[in-house]
Amino acid sequence: TPLGPASSLPQSFLLKCLEQVRKIQGDGAALQEKLCATYKLCHPEELVLLGHSLGIPWAPLSSCPSQALQLAGCLSQLHSGLFLYQGLLQALEGISPELGPTLDTLQLDVADFATTIWQQMEELGMAPALQPTQGAMPAFASAFQRRAGGVLVASHLQSFLEVSYRVLRHLAQP
């Protein structure tokens, strides 16, 4: 059933989520900046075809439009999306020594955000009985593919977070 911004999500949860989204956006931007500065990989739109061939997936948020928001479905899609990005970021491991610490922090911040969402789902009795299982992740055959994959994953994640932020801000409005 559609639920608008007056739904029963605690304000403290929503504010925590907004904080976390902005933290991850900062991490993601730092990763993008380093990929651009170090490897001149600055334009994700130029790598879209490579992204298709590598099989880098997108995470949907179709249950989250503000006009017909389905709370359980939206939280579930948020969590599943974050779970997907944990796997994608894991696939980027070893991308380069310069990017390692930034990627490490991004990975943990995404995991912590997924935890916050799940915690709230549990409190509302909405958490699924089982965690989603990780689907097949892209295999990068070369250093270039891994770096290009990094650009695309960071770009996809930023788009996902922008939508997430809009949804959460909408829900946080009194």
Epitope: K23, G26, D104, T105, A114, T115, T116, Q119, A127, Q134
Partner: antibody
């Protein structure tokens, strides 16, 4: 309520390995990261790394990358830390602590496991 | 890695008197989201550490309000308005802005 119960004290010879366990209860184990922290005798706290049980991903402090291996068993809600090629400087109390964000980060700790390395 | 430096390392205090511990980070812990990723932990004798303050100034659940945290991006202070005997132990500041998480060396608070 949340409990983290660690395995008992260990005495090991130099060059040996040791595996410390941290059994979690009172929450959905795979959802939270589990971190490990070292405290050498009379010293401060050092972050070793963490395991994300939901995807089996472990991340390490560079300093401990060749020393510690973190794993987790979702079926028993237990996190493990294996320390290899033990030396006297590995003698310490090792803590597991539950991860999270904000007021959740390290809000719960195990009781600590003393690992003594002595010939 | 971000280096956390505490002072003093030892702090003798008379019960009922205030106490103050300083912590400095080698990099600003203030994120662009407005949050300062600085934590304080207390390790009482023979115990595991416990969370006191999160995100620089927020009191953790069950922590008495005689504790308070403040600071800027790189300089932080933990204050105890009136020290009690149960407050003895080692206080650690820590950052969780980025990995690896790092702790200060600790400040040992003891009763005079």
């Amino acid at each position: 309520q949340v409990h983290l119960v660690q395995s008992g004290a260990e005495v090991k010879k130099p060059g040996a390995s040791v595996k410390v366990s941290c059994k979690a209860s009172g929450y959905t184990f795979p959802i939270y990261t589990m971190h490990w922290i070292k405290q050498a005798p009379g010293q401060g706290l050092e972050w070793i790394g963490y395991i994300n049980p939901s995807i089996g991903y472990a991340n390490y402090n560079q300093k401990f990358r060749d020393k510690a291996t973190l794993t987790a068993d979702k079926s028993t809600s237990t996190a493990y830390m294996e320390l290899s090629s033990l030396r006297s400087e590995d003698t310490a109390v090792y803590y597991c602590a539950r991860g999270g964000y904000g007021d959740s980060l390290f809000a719960y700790w195990g009781q600590g496991t003393l690992v003594t390395v002595s010939s | 890695d971000i280096v956390m430096t505490q002072s003093p390392l030892s702090l003798p205090v008379t019960p009922g008197e205030p106490a103050s511990i300083s912590c400095r980070s080698s990099k600003s812990l203030l994120h662009s989201n407005g949050i300062t990723y600085l934590y304080w932990y207390l390790q009482k004798p023979g115990q595991s550490p416990q969370l006191l303050i999160y995100q620089m100034s927020n009191l953790a659940s069950g922590v008495p309000d005689r504790f308070s945290g403040s600071g800027s991006g790189t300089d932080f202070t933990l204050k105890i308005s009136r020290v009690e005997a149960e407050d003895v132990g080692v206080y650690y500041c820590a950052q969780n802005l980025e990995l690896p998480y790092t702790f200060g060396q600790g400040t040992k608070l003891e009763i005079k």
